[in-house]
């Protein structure tokens, strides 16, 4: 068997660090056998069999000019093997961040904090952390570790499925190359990394006969579980075309009637979502949707509206039933502060 331990990486390649002494090992001989070393394609002897170094070649303070292929020969001139030297650096701890678009799963992505110049792979795992004792604030790694399955096709991402919202997790991402390994540990809780995807299906419609009103509606993001234990709340922004500043409101449901739109002007509207009890952060904004208030007369039948902003508007007072709320039942963890029977909307 070869006297040369095979480092992780392609066969026939040995590794070293620039500025450091590097030992190359002749793979096809017995340990200690004296050999001669040459650079591939060069007749000049680099190190003879009488060096006292046996099957090894020592390069003091290696630099980029030392990279390449080396040939070792036994005393009888037989080929002991060829070795390719590649220089690089040991791994540094990768940079890791984790995010969750729902309350059941989270993903972690990583980047090298320093390029090693060598073949590199990543080992990803996680543990669930538990509190020690009912009154203790100390936490210790307990269950696991379990692998954090990596995306196929080499994307620097792994996903933890079926996570517990109230638990803490310790993520381990280890960068490995032929010169060593380096580990980044990251403590995460779903509550703090939760960031929903933006709401979908945003529509902005005029309200016939009301020149200062726009009705916006949207749906939960598709990534949010269909039967959510946890509701989302929303933030809506709108502004007339060419107007730099956004107006912001927090709707109670999945629609909002804007009552202070500028008559005759198109308005941009966008929405964002967040966990109902303020876990994590607001989503990014949805793509903007546009709508222009109507210019016609007041219709005989009034459409249904959700919660309204009662800004003065030169229009008659009309009573209108509100639409039903989305059938999303709250989890016992939260008490929905909205009235269970919505009040009749009053248009002022």
């Amino acid at each position: 068997s070869s006297p040369c331990p095979q480092a992780w990486g392609p066969p026939g390649v040995q590794y070293g660090q620039p500025g450091r002494s590097v030992k190359l090992c002749c793979p096809g001989v017995t340990a200690g056998d004296p050999v001669s070393w040459f650079r591939d394609g060069e007749p000049k002897l680099l190190q003879g069999p009488d060096s006292g170094l046996g099957h090894e070649l020592v390069l003091a303070q290696a630099d980029s000019t030392d990279e390449g292929t080396y040939i070792c020969q036994t005393l009888d001139g037989a080929l002991g093997g060829t070795v390719t030297l590649q220089l690089g650096y040991p791994p540094a701890r990768p940079v890791v961040s984790c995010q969750a678009a729902d309350y059941e799963n989270f993903s972690c992505t990583w980047s090298p904090s320093q390029i090693s110049g060598l073949p590199t792979r990543y080992l990803t795992s996680y543990r669930k952390k538990t509190v020690l004792g009912a009154d203790s604030q100390r936490r210790s790694p307990s269950t696991g570790p379990w692998p954090c399955p990596q995306d196929p096709l080499g994307a620097a991402r792994c996903v933890v499925h079926g996570a517990e919202f109230w638990s803490q997790y310790r993520i381990n991402v280890t960068e490995v190359n032929p010169l060593g390994a380096s580990t980044r540990l990251l403590d995460v809780s779903l509550q703090s990394i939760l960031r929903p995807d933006p709401p979908q299906g945003l529509r902005v419609e005029s309200v016939p006969g009301y020149p200062r009103r726009l009705r916006a509606s949207w749906t939960y993001p598709a990534s949010w579980p269909c039967q959510p234990h946890f509701l989302l709340k929303f933030r809506l922004q709108y502004r007339p075309a060419q107007h730099p500043a956004w107006s912001t409101v927090e709707p109670a449901g999945l629609e909002e009637v804007i009552t202070d739109a500028v008559a005759g002007l198109p308005h941009a509207v966008r929405v964002s979502a967040r966990d109902f009890l303020d876990a994590g952060t607001w989503s990014t904004w949805s793509p903007e949707a546009w709508g222009t208030p109507s210019t016609g007369t007041i219709p005989k039948e009034i459409p249904a509206w959700g919660q309204l902003h009662t800004q003065p508007e030169v229009e008659p007072q009309v009573d209108s039933p509100a639409p039903p709320r989305p059938s999303l039942q709250p989890h016992p963890r939260l008490l929905d502060h909205r009235d269970s029977v919505e009040q009749v909307a009053v248009l002022a």
């Epitope: 961040s97 980047s111 904090s113 390029i115 380096s182």
Partner: antibody, heavy 118, light 107 residues
Amino acid sequence: EVQLLESGGGLVQPGGSLRLSCAASGFTFSWYSMTWVRQAPGKGLEWVSSIVPSGGHTQYADSVKGRFTISRDNSKNTLYLQMNSLRAEDTAVYYCAKPHDWGRFDLWGRGTLVTVSS
Amino acid sequence: DIQMTQSPSSLSASVGDRVTITCQASQDINNYLNWYQQKPGKAPKLLIYDASNLQTGVPSRFSGSGSGTDFTFTISSLQPEDIATYYCQQYDNLSPTFGPGTKVDIK
């Protein structure tokens, strides 16, 4: 010679913007994370922001989050810091630094002074 | 964020004296602690990394020790050129933090 050279500092009014640059030479810039560290007059050192070699991960101090943006152009061996909504408390010498393993700063520039005042 | 405290905030010593500065982290940072020297009007210079490793080219009179939350920086024999402010800095997590500094001058 291995060095970092900051530029772009100056006097700016509160609420204004400034873009700092850091030109790197003498090492393989695209292999290393890069960092901005600042020092207010007569005060200590404060880490501001860091970016990985690919630019794919960035990190910010809470004091600048949402106002400052770190970026890099590996083809130009240059690091940037876009500073918006500047405040008086952002007045400082801003240093560009090359870390090993994200946080061991083994190479520093000379710094560039940013003064935020009306 | 991890808080770093240093003591003393300043000290005066004679040339040849042994000088010791301590640094404490608000939580365990393993050995991810560096020490820097900064002279007036100059950029900081890395002296010690990973608690106890001497940066290349730094005189051997500088040393560091410690692990976890408590760390010590020592100048075995103070020299006139060592007049400076010394900072500890952790990088256990992705938001590095510096200590407030210790100003060292000559008696």
